[in-house]
């Protein structure tokens, strides 16, 4: 099943210590979806979306980004016939930067 | 089926105040952000506003930005849209936009309301 | 703010055809675009969403693809009710911007 989509949402850190909002997004025929939050390979956090919700966003307190790792990536699972488990493709990385750039 | 109701348009003279309805009907209102876009006679469209499910959070174009105030009522099911000290370039049709099944703006938008036109003239 | 443009601002075709349009925008938007079909008088309705995903209930002759900064959108097998008027438009930031459409009528 096709892979989320991730982003950076506001309000952006402007430095290591504030706290990551980062959005992850199933294509809209998936709603309801378990989400799950990677950094370099090792679970950061899972969330459901509500049923009626095709995404999630993991707020990651202060501090988040100075632990070893890389980019974080997302995934998500749903129930497919028979009751079994799917699991997405991993979204692309996302990269935090300091400060966040706006356009 | 989902559908948005805009109600209010009219003529209006330059200066005066309007406010548009738009009330949602066939899901959970509360659980989507919504959005105010608009389209002038014959022109492209224009991203007016967002406001996030709970209402704690409220962006605008810079063109409305100080005189227009988008708001809603999830025990209704109901958008709205406070417009001040309009003018002729505010003249176009008004249409609600839910938020592509999530709860901020960064979700895109999916279906839209039929639009109510607003017609600024002396 | 992200300036979004679209190539042809109109065409002309025929029932049965393919036609491509293209949209670029001014910044990267990754696969945060959305394309809209719009018949005179009507509402906007969502086609194509994350630049390549069909709304439920959509046609498969409608298609998108792309990513950054250039995207395509694609309809093979022109049908009557196709002849109107689309356009792109990116979420991935505010403001909300849109391509100033491509009108596709009747040759």
């Known amino acids: 099943i096709p892979a989320p989509s991730i982003r950076l949402v506001p309000p952006y850190p402007s430095s290591q210590e504030d706290p990551i909002h980062i959005a992850c997004m199933a294509p809209g025929n998936f709603p309801g979806a378990n989400f799950t939050l990677y950094r370099g390979g090792q679970v950061v956090q899972l969330l459901q979306a509500p049923t009626d919700q095709r995404g999630v966003t993991f707020n990651l307190s202060g501090g988040s980004s100075k632990a070893p790792g890389g980019p974080f990536h997302c995934q998500y699972g749903v129930l497919g016939e028979l009751n079994q488990s799917q699991l997405s493709d991993l979204s692309e990385p996302v990269n935090v930067s300091f400060p966040v750039p706006t356009w | 089926e989902v559908q948005l109701v805009e109600t209010g348009g009219g003529l209006i003279q330059p200066g005066r105040s309007l406010r548009l309805s738009c009330v949602a009907s066939d899901f959970r209102f509360s659980n989507h952000a919504m959005h105010w876009v608009r389209q002038a006679p014959g022109k492209e469209l224009e991203w007016v506003a967002v406001i996030s499910s709970d209402g704690s959070n409220r962006q605008y174009a810079y063109s409305v930005k100080g005189r227009f105030t988008i708001s809603r009522d999830n025990s209704k099911n109901t958008l709205y849209l406070e417009m001040n000290i309009l003018g002729p370039e505010d003249t176009a049709v008004y249409f609600c936009?839910?938020?592509?099944?999530?709860?901020?703006?960064?979700?895109?938008?999916?279906?839209w309301g039929q639009g109510t036109t607003v017609t600024v003239s002396s | 703010d992200i300036q979004m443009t679209q190539s042809p601002s109109s065409l002309s075709a025929s029932v049965g055809d393919r036609v491509t349009i293209t949209c670029q925008a001014s910044h990267d938007i990754r696969k945060f675009l959305n394309w809209y079909q719009q018949h005179p008088g009507k509402a906007p309705k969502l086609l194509i969403y994350d630049a390549a995903y069909s709304e439920i209930g959509v046609p498969s002759r409608f298609s998108g693809g792309g990513s950054g900064t250039d995207f395509t959108f694609t309809i093979n097998n022109l049908q009557p009710d196709d002849f109107a008027t689309y356009y792109c438009?990116?979420?991935?930031?505010?403001?909300?911007?849109f391509g100033p459409g491509t009108k596709v009528d009747i040759k």
């Open positions: 438009q990116q979420y991935e930031s505010l403001p909300f911007t």
């Open positions: 936009v839910r938020s592509h099944l999530g709860p901020e703006w960064y979700y895109g938008m999916d279906v």
